[in-house]
Interface confidence: medium
């Protein structure tokens, strides 16, 4: 029976997950009466950033006043579909996925804003949203058409702890380099000076030797 | 095979509270494609739905019993309760646990039923 | 709250003979209703939901059909463990309500 819930799936992408082996087509054909269709909208294409993160919105129209909602994403690839994460949330409140999910949302009105992370290569993909309006009666279901998710990997960066250290060395020993040059240049300075001089020659007239002044006392009449 | 066993059926006293438990076996309460419910019956008559839980503790009353109605779950015993309060002798009936699937608001499995008798 | 209103109440019928229940709803429903089997000091047990689909494991003898306010319960031939009481319940809306029951006895 196509239309089960979903069982609650603790994530991660590329480790061993829940698939079902049948294709979405086969999920979608074999939906039961007792499941009452409803519309959701998501983009065709999202290419995710560089650190691995996708982001889409996911709009859904409802028929009716939902105050339950669950929303889940699936992901399709290779004829098999995954359970990627899922949330169960009270109309106005936020959206909470497990503790440990890969997925992040909010919501706001028939709109649901979801983010997954941590993101690589191998985990391009169809990615569609799966809404249920669970309270009150009664129960609709509603499927995206499923947005492609481009994972591109990075070029691979040094260790960043590693980076670190290198970044270090090289200031440390530019320092060093720049004080032993300091130290060098100015010694060399110092050899080519008199030790008494100034480093400016002035011709001066010569001098008698000190002698002690002999200071006259003034008087100063006050009237 | 799923299994439902209702247990804290007796005689309570008018003004009281009634307590109930369901423990389910052969199945997870944590399942998230299914609700948990109460049914009563009065002896004689037909059948009032009461309430639902859903695993993460999400829950929806009968609005004519909401007032006195709580109804909990306990993941790690596989089991929810209910309890309700003020009770008079118009709350006398068998008390039935059922489980629903997300998607049907009608109940496919049951547990065999415990009397409550509201009596002084 | 959406009343569900079910006849007859009690019918005698035969063992081989085809029962017809019926059960009205005071609003549409569209086809959220279920039906229950239910034999005295037991729990009820479902036979269809969504208004025509059939329990597993329930004989094919029992079928439903309806949709908006009026439904129909039907035993194409009644066979002796058959006798017992049947509930129709909606699941449209907040509360979920049961008709009244119908009684089938044997005649």
């Known amino acids: 029976m196509a239309c089960l819930g979903f069982q609650r799936h603790k994530a991660q992408l590329n480790l061993a997950t829940r698939t079902w082996p049948c294709t979405l087509l086969f999920f979608l054909l074999f939906i039961p009466v007792f499941c009452k269709a409803m519309h959701v909208a998501q983009p065709a294409v999202v290419l995710a950033s560089s650190r691995g993160i996708a982001s889409f919105v996911c709009e859904y129209a409802s028929p009716g006043k939902a105050t339950e909602v669950r929303v889940t994403v699936l992901r399709q690839a290779d004829s098999q579909v995954t359970e990627v994460c899922a949330a169960t949330y009270m109309m106005g409140n936020e959206l909470t996925f497990l503790d440990d999910s890969i997925c992040t949302g909010t919501s706001s009105g028939n709109q649901v804003n979801l983010t997954i992370q941590g993101l690589r290569a191998m985990d391009t993909g169809l990615y569609i949203c799966k809404v249920e309006l669970m309270y009150p009666p009664p129960y609709y279901l509603g499927i995206g058409n499923g947005t492609q998710i481009y994972v591109i990997d990075p070029e691979p960066c040094p260790d960043s702890d590693f980076l670190l250290w290198i970044l270090a060395a090289v200031s440390s020993g530019l320092f060093f380099y720049s004080f032993l040059l300091t130290a060098v240049s100015l010694s060399k300075m110092l050899k080519k000076r008199s030790p008494l001089t100034t480093g400016v020659y002035v011709k001066m007239p010569p001098t008698e030797p000190e002698c002690e002044k002999q200071f006259q006392p003034y008087f100063i009449p006050i009237n | 095979q799923l299994q439902l066993q209702e247990s804290g059926g007796g005689v309570v006293r008018p003004g009281g509270s009634l307590r109930l438990s369901c423990t389910v076996s052969g199945g997870s309460i944590s399942s998230s494609s299914y609700y948990w419910g109460w049914i009563r019956q009065p002896p004689g008559k037909g059948l009032e739905w009461i309430g639902n839980i859903y695993y993460s503790g999400n829950t929806y009353y009968n609005p004519s019993l909401k007032s006195r109605v709580t109804i909990s779950v306990d993941t790690s015993k596989n089991q929810f309760s209910l309890k309700l309060s003020s009770v008079t002798a118009a709350d006398t009936a068998v008390y039935y646990c059922a489980r629903r699937r997300i998607q049907l608001w009608s109940f496919d499995y049951w547990g065999q039923g415990t009397l409550v008798t509201v009596s002084s | 709250d959406i009343q569900m209103t079910q006849s007859p109440s009690s019918l005698s019928a035969s063992v081989g003979d085809r029962v017809t229940i019926t059960c009205r709803a005071s609003?549409?429903?569209?086809?959220?209703l279920g039906w229950y089997q239910q034999k005295p000091g037991k729990a009820p047990k479902r036979l269809i939901y969504a208004a025509s689909s059939l329990q597993s494991g329930v004989p094919s003898r029992f079928s439903g059909s309806g949709s908006g306010t009026d439904f129909t319960l039907t035993i194409s031939s009644l066979q002796p463990e058959d006798f017992a009481t049947y509930y129709c319940q909606q699941s449209y809306s907040n509360p979920l309500t049961f008709g009244g029951g119908t009684k089938v006895e044997i005649k």
């Open positions: 609003q549409g429903i569209r086809n959220d």
